[in-house]
Structure formats: C-alpha cells, structure tokens
C-alpha cells in the first residue's frame, strides 16, 4: 500500500491539542501520534477521535492510565455520555519514554499499534466518517501527528514513493492552550509542497512477509535495512523529514544520511559505543570535521523507540529528537535541491518514514 495525497503533519504541537483531520476519517487512513510520556506530572493521557472541538462526541477515546499497575481505557462518548469502557490491563507506554502510536482506521474497527506492535482493536460504535478532529491531552509531549491516506497504486518492492497530485500546506495553527516547551521549533514553519510516507511490503497486496498475518493489519511493518529512498525535489527551506523507530537492544551505532550523488551532505550517527551523536559531511569519500556537541544527554537509548525530525532551513538543518531540539547543522553542501536521497542503516528498526 502506498500513501499519497496525505494531510501534512502537525509538528511539535502544544498539549492540550486539537486539530482538524482534513476530509475526516476514511477506511485505510493511518494516523501516527509520536511523542514522549511526561515523567513528572500526571498519570494519564488521551488521544481522541471526535466530531468538532467540544469533546461531547468522541468516536474513539484512547486513554492510557499509569494507575493501579497501568492499563488503557478505550471508550466512546455520544452526546456527552460515555459508553461502557473497554480496558486493556497491559501498559505499553512508559513514563519519560518516547512512543510511536499508530491508529489504522478500518471498516469494522480501529487497529492501534504501539511502537510497531499491534496493541488493541476497538470496534466502531458510531460511524467513523463523522470524525473530523483529533485531540490529545494529558501527561504527554508531542513530536508530531502525521496522516497517511491510502491509495491503491502499483507498489515497488521494498518501499514506494508516490508524489502528491496537489500541493499540501500545513493546516491552520492548532488550538493549543499552552505554549510549546522551550527548545521546540514553530509547528508550522512554512508550506510544504510534497510529503511522501514510505511503507513496505513483501509482495503485491501484502504488507509483510509473515503469511499468517493478514494484509494491512500492521501499518508499520519492519522496514528493510538499510533503507534508501528518494527525497522528491531534494531539500529546500521548510522541508521536513520525519523518522521514527526503535533502537535495537544490543545497538552499537546507526546512521541517517541525507545524500547528494556520491556524497553524504548530512551524516547523523548516534554511537552507543561512544555515547555520542556524531554529525559530519562526506564529499568525494572525504569526511569533514565531526560535530558532537549536545545541549543535554544522549537522547537515544538502546531498546527504546525514538523520533527524529529534520527541518531544513536556509543556512542549516535543525534536528529534534523526541520533540526536543537537539542541534543545528550548518550546510556544507549548499546546493540543497541536489540533496535528494535518504539512507538509514545500522542497529535500529524503522517504524515510520516521511519525506
């Protein structure tokens, strides 16, 4: 399944957050909420798929609670009244830890993935096409919320990239009632004209190689590693690249490269063996000087999920990890449109790539 014509993501939105789902929910729509559970305050957070902004009509209320050993409540609210709760007594989230939460809308239910693993199915109690808003509240900080509309097209093996037929711009500023935490960039720096979500499949009509799993059950199957894809149109100011995944428990290193021909314009190389995040450029097989400084401790942790947001600006790349600004990398290859290939490799499992 390839995704195209998708709504542009909300980037580092403030919590509490409410934002429009352009076109409402559709069968096959995949919504990814990427963020970090706050470790300090509160014991709950919630993601709501609702009609309008009032909160009286919530088709799907997804509510992790760090109480009584931890559990997740799923429910529906109609005309201000809650229905019977469905409880899952397993807690897939950890306080202080990043997460990748994906909702796949299907004709009979929502399928919910947490860090690439199917967590729960919630059968529709009201018609899902009424939903036009997503809201997030509680003890959570958001990195991004992204949208992937399905479109049946022939898919290239390993991954596919399908350009938009229409330009897509960032939606209006979300209705947040609190300022973003310091160190996070503006949510909507500039219009984006193309966004491509990359998904993988092993054979036509099948999303992954395990035959026992029916197609489309997992919206985030394991990406082939190394993962290589084209960045349509190359880099330009305001261009965003989003990646999320999980660091392998025994990880030594991984890398995210933005490439231009044979050259690596930007090499992002977390090294667990050195407890460092190395940045560099390689041109003609020659590495430049490494940049290693960080404003805080190493943000990547073995065995834990992460999100990386790379924002291209005129003079530099801004990189945020788990929604928090980490560093700037001033362009060494300044012909930005020629930087048109993304390569990811090393000791991680990718769950989401958006170029």
């Amino acid at each position: 399944m390839a995704f195209s014509g998708s709504q542009a993501p909300y980037l580092s939105p403030a919590v509490p957050f409410s934002g429009t789902i352009q076109g409402g929910l559709q069968d096959g729509l995949q919504i990814t909420v990427n963020g970090t559970v706050l470790s300090s305050s509160g014991t709950r957070f919630a993601v709501n798929f609702q009609t309008g902004f009032s909160g009286n009509d919530i088709a799907f209320h997804f509510n992790p609670r760090f109480e009584d050993g931890g559990y997740v409540v799923c429910n529906t609210r109609q005309n201000g009244s809650w229905g019977p709760e469905e409880r899952k007594t397993h807690m897939p989230f950890q306080k202080g830890m990043p997460f990748d939460l994906c909702f796949l809308v299907q004709s009979s239910d929502f399928k919910v993935m947490v860090n690439g693993i199917l967590f729960v199915q919630y059968f529709h109690r009201v018609p899902f096409h009424r939903v036009d808003t997503i809201s997030v509240n509680g003890s959570v900080q958001l990195s991004y919320i992204s949208f992937q509309n399905p479109r049946t097209v022939p898919v290239q093996p390993a991954f596919s990239t399908v350009p938009f037929s229409q330009p897509v711009c960032f939606p209006p500023r979300p209705r947040g009632r609190r300022q973003k935490p310091p160190g996070v960039w503006p949510a909507n720096p500039a219009p984006i004209t193309q966004t491509v979500i990359h998904t993988v499949q092993s054979a036509p009509g099948q999303m992954f190689s395990t035959p026992a799993i029916p197609p489309m059950m997992y919206p985030h199957p394991a990406y082939p590693m190394p993962f290589i894809t084209t960045i349509l149109g190359g880099l330009y100011p305001s261009k965003s690249i989003l990646l999320s995944g999980t660091v392998l428990p025994s990880a030594q290193r991984f890398h995210i490269n933005l490439c231009s021909g044979n050259h690596i314009a930007f090499h992002l190389n977390p090294r667990f063996d050195e407890n460092a995040v190395v940045r560099n450029t390689q041109i003609d097989n020659s590495w430049g000087s490494e940049e290693r400084s960080l404003p805080r401790k190493m943000p990547f942790v073995r065995g834990q999920s992460f999100s990386v947001w790379i924002l291209c600006e005129a003079h530099c790349l801004k990189v945020a990890v788990d929604g928090q600004h980490l560093f700037e990398y001033y362009h060494r290859l300044r012909n930005l449109p020629t930087i048109n290939r993304l390569e990811v490799g090393g000791d991680i499992q990718l769950t989401h790539v958006q170029t």
């Epitope: 041109i283 097989n285 060494r332 300044r334």
Partner: antibody, heavy 123, light 107 residues
Framework: EVQLVESGGGLVQPGGSLRLSCAAS????????IHWVRQAPGKGLEWVAS????????SYADSVKGRFTISADTSKNTAYLQMNSLRAEDTAVYYC????????????????WGQGTLVTVSS | DIQMTQSPSSLSASVGDRVTITCRAS??????VAWYQQKPGKAPKLLIY???SLYSGVPSRFSGSRSGTDFTLTISSLQPEDFATYYC?????????FGQGTKVEIK
Amino acid sequence: EVQLVESGGGLVQPGGSLRLSCAASGFTVYSSSIHWVRQAPGKGLEWVASIYSSYGYTSYADSVKGRFTISADTSKNTAYLQMNSLRAEDTAVYYCARSYSSETHYGWAMDYWGQGTLVTVSS
Amino acid sequence: DIQMTQSPSSLSASVGDRVTITCRASQSVSSAVAWYQQKPGKAPKLLIYSASSLYSGVPSRFSGSRSGTDFTLTISSLQPEDFATYYCQQWSQSPVTFGQGTKVEIK
C-alpha cells in the same frame, strides 16, 4: 586535453591581498572538485582549500580559514583563491589541482595539476 | 588532523634496485590514500590512488599496497627517471594531509 593554468602570484607585503586564478580546459570546473595545494620553498605539500561547485561545497585548512576564500566562475571555467591578510608563512608555490574521478573511483586523488604560481609575502 | 608519517625521509639507490617507501596514518583512513612523484620545479604527478590502484599511464613497476594504517609504495626496478621526491596523501578525513616526502637519490 585537460589543462590547469594558474596565475596571479607575485610579491605582496604582509597584511596584503592577492587573488589567484586557475583557468581550466578540457573539463568543467562546475562538475569537478578543485583544490589549491601549496609548497613552501624546500618544503613538502600542504593542502589549502577545495571547492565542488555543483554541490555548493567549500573546505579550508585551519591555517587559512577566515583569510582565504575559494570560489569558481563556471562561465569562465575558472577557480579562484582570494588571499587576504597574508603572512610571511603563506609564501609558497600555489598549485591548483583537479580530483581524479571515474566510474569506479571518486576521491581526492589529484590527477591534473597546474604548473604553479609563486606567492611571496615579504616587506 | 590525520598525520601521515612517511619513511624514510631520503634514500640512495641504484638503477634496477627495488625501492620501498612507507607511510603510516595516525588513524584509520581506509584506502583513501594516493602517492605522487614530484621532480624539482615541477608539479606533482599522480602515481597510485585508492592505496593500490595504478593511475593510467603510470609504468607498472610502481605499485601500492595497504596493511591496516600502513601504506607502501614500491618501485620494483628503479629507472633513471624515477629519481624524485615521493609523497603520500590521505583524503579520508578533512583536512587532506600529505606525508613529508621521501627523496630518492642516485647512490
């Protein structure tokens, strides 16, 4: 035939400026990496700066960073080295060179060199 | 910066001799090493690139090899036109650095 011809060297006082030119023929400066390498009298080779115009890339040795600027005029197929705040230790023969590249190799092995131009910084 | 320590700094040899010049990198440079020949008053000439690849037009008596961070230029049978100064160079990491040179003189 590939050829590189340097010009612009001469005698200059400390603190002065010079602009060296490297006129290329037989290939395009835009799609190649061009380097300046210098050699002080009786000494070895020292890399100074590099440019790869098509990628908007420039790089400098620490000893010249902030004083020298490498550039290229692709319409003239010429690379330049603007040298400001010159010091006695910048006295050297300055060579421009091109990186060798082929279908199986790319790197900064320099296959064509100019004849060099002498820069003398002295009062 | 990566240091390229070249040895010997000079050597005397006779026509027909086998000559070996070594260069040791202060850290790993993979195979991103080249060798040049320079004669007085002339620009350097490329002999070997990528540690062991012979540049076109260079006589086959010149060869290069690598063992870890040690690089060797070998002239199997020294010819009269080979008396010159030889430099190694690494480009694995900026700044590009050269060895200090080995002068090959007539014995």
